[in-house]
Amino acid sequence: MMTGTIETTGNISAEKGGSIILQCHLSSTTAQVTQVNWEQQDQLLAICNADLGWHISPSFKDRVAPGPGLGLTLQSLTVNDTGEYFCIYHTYPDGTYTGRIFLEVLESSVAEHGARFQIP
């Protein structure tokens, strides 16, 4: 039985040109995490593997930084970065847990007045 749950930062907004931290946390399970994949729609952004550490997809190398922890930092945000992001936890023995985050990248002035769920 997969008893675990993934808590995420939920719906977040950030301003164009800025950066944001995407974070997920797996709880309520004894399962052990072997690998975490970060994906945007169907594109792989990054992998954090228990043995091999972090691997950032070449097309995102300039704008994606690993961490903190199993999270992911997106930098130099553009409006095109708006969309769904998924953290996929590969665990033993439960299998796969998936968390969803929706990021909205706003023009600077809009973000200043309407920033919701902003991560400090």
Epitope: Q32, V33, T34, Q35, A50, Y92, P93, G95
Partner: antibody, heavy 119, light 109 residues
Framework: QVQLVQSGAEVKKPGASVKVSCKAS????????MNWVRQAPGQGLEWMGW????????TYAQKFQGRVTMTLDTSTSTAYMELSSLRSEDTAVYYC????????????WGQGTLVTVSS | QAVVTQEPSLTVSPGGTVTLTCGSS?????????ANWVQQKPGQAFRGLIR???GRGSWTPARFSGSLLGGKAALTISGAQPEDEAEYYC?????????FGGGTKLTVL
Amino acid sequence: QVQLVQSGAEVKKPGASVKVSCKASGYTFTNYGMNWVRQAPGQGLEWMGWINTYTGEPTYAQKFQGRVTMTLDTSTSTAYMELSSLRSEDTAVYYCSRGNGYYVGMDYWGQGTLVTVSS
Amino acid sequence: QAVVTQEPSLTVSPGGTVTLTCGSSTGAVTTSNHANWVQQKPGQAFRGLIRGTNGRGSWTPARFSGSLLGGKAALTISGAQPEDEAEYYCALWFSNHWVFGGGTKLTVL
């Protein structure tokens, strides 16, 4: 390369306990679960349980609940399985195997430890 | 507890293809059962060949593949080699425990 090296054969009397060790090398011990599986002579494999090597939390198969204890020494990358109140039916080869969550299952296995229970 | 069934023995000619199956008494095997295939050659340690239904170990030759077939987990060896002669065990995950099949003795003849 990944290796799981187990302790040597044991002969025990009925009612006694046995403690089998499994020393891991070639990877970060606390990143992967550790299972214990046994095989009685001429029989198939039987899963006994697993231990989360990061938190130290064990999960035991119902059949062995109350008789088995799985522990760790993370400083030496060693997992232990202790089985108490031994009976002749516990005569078997005991294996440790690494639990991998990327494609869930057991990838590496120890060489096995023969435990003979005889009066 | 669920019972996991395998063919007790199978024979394949060198270069031939053979499929070993793994069924569950509880119904169709699904990806949630994380089917595993483990190989044991005489006098050698067990080796995990396939995990999570179709995931190969880094040492698993490409001729071994895992799948779901007709409600069972399956291990197919395409182009069998003499060194594939061994005992093969499948294991299925049932919510909180693994159950192993009785094993298939594969002869390459």
